[in-house]
């Protein structure tokens, strides 16, 4: 499955929108920074079959979409930017879902992929727990925004590697 070039552009647009969503200076929130334990090893793309990589990417985008689709998120961000950001993520999910269906038919996805998906889910659970503990404060959301920018950039890099494999 070849991810369309528009998918890559959509990923960049999502990152830019996320950058624009910042409402307060990140530098006023330095003390709130947190180690969420991003599962970097799941995104290095070396030990993966293509089907595995795509399903991990899908989980990453799905969890990001879910996080920014909550009521608390709606209250935290400027509505039009949030809607554009969600639309970009939704389009990426559609692209990836089409690929997951195609690729799973080609390769049997081993059990280790479930571990990778679980690692991504636990990562987002830690983010949600942090937001809850910080009572969804503006700084907590700002820290999470920066964290998601980091994780989305890992996703972008994995997608680039997948395209090079094609």
């Amino acid at each position: 499955c070849d991810l369309p070039q528009t998918h890559s552009l959509g990923n960049r647009r999502a990152l830019i929108l996320l950058a624009q969503m910042g409402r307060i200076s990140h530098f006023s929130c330095l003390k709130d920074r947190h180690d969420f334990g991003f599962p970097e090893e799941e995104f290095d793309g070396h030990q993966f079959q293509k089907a595995q990589a795509i399903s991990v990417l899908h989980e990453m985008i799905q969890q990001t979409f879910n996080l920014f689709s909550t009521e608390d998120s709606s209250a935290a961000w400027e509505q039009s930017l949030l809607e554009k950001f969600s639309t970009e993520l939704y389009q990426q999910l559609n692209d990836l879902e089409a690929c997951v269906i195609q690729e799973v038919g080609v390769e049997e996805t081993p059990l280790m992929n479930e571990d990778s998906i679980l690692a991504v889910r636990k990562y987002f659970q830690r983010i949600t727990l942090y937001l809850t503990e910080k009572k969804y404060s503006p700084c907590a959301w700002e820290v999470v925004r920066a964290e998601i920018m980091r994780s989305l950039s890992f996703s972008t890099n994995l997608q680039k590697r997948l395209r090079r494999k094609d």
């Epitope: 950058a19 990140h26 330095l30 180690d35 820290v143 920066a146 980091r150």
Partner: antibody, heavy 120, light 111 residues
Framework: QVQLQESGTVLARPGASVKMSCKAS????????MHWVKQRPGQGLEWIGV????????TYNQKFKDKAKLTAVTSANTAYMELSSLTNEDSAVYFC?????????????WGQGTTVTVSS | DIVLTQSPASLAVSLGQRATISCRAS??????????MHWYQQKPGQTPKLLIY???NLESGVPARFSGSGSGTDFTLNIHPVEEEDAATYYC?????????FGSGTKLEIK
Amino acid sequence: QVQLQESGTVLARPGASVKMSCKASGYSFTTYWMHWVKQRPGQGLEWIGVIYPGNGDTTYNQKFKDKAKLTAVTSANTAYMELSSLTNEDSAVYFCTRNYKYDYYTMDYWGQGTTVTVSS
Amino acid sequence: DIVLTQSPASLAVSLGQRATISCRASKSVSTSGHSYMHWYQQKPGQTPKLLIYLASNLESGVPARFSGSGSGTDFTLNIHPVEEEDAATYYCQHSGELPFTFGSGTKLEIK
């Protein structure tokens, strides 16, 4: 590969202003903070400030807030720093540096530096 | 501002031996799982190069003979075994709060 190309050596008079550039290539310019760092001859490093080209957000070291102005033109993938009211103390090498991993605020790629000499 | 005090100011180490550079912050730069201290190497006439980030993480492409440790206010850069190409000035930098500051540098000479 990531490259930061800075403008050349500048000679300026005391009291004047200078504007230096830093052209980025090999990465998404709009999604990385860009720091500026000062190094006087034979001395250590000083952090001046940082700009986010994606939205123009800037943060300065208070020591430099009346001295330096950071801007970026995304269409040209270029960041700029303007130094005003120059004195001998401003004679230094100025580096633009790409921020690493969003909120770690460390610097992974550096330009080759712009040398500013202030002399009457 | 957080002041970073590096020691020693200079040291000479024999080839193959261990070089240890210390960086002490006037205030803690650690918070919630991360220590916001980083290390750079600068060779004469060159730009600084990132070696270690977040106190102990080796930057990609940096040889494994470089290692960092510490938390709170006390941090250490170790180089072992030292090689000739390691002759340089080493700087620590914190990003715990604004403004970010650098240490005054440690010049390493290889004997």
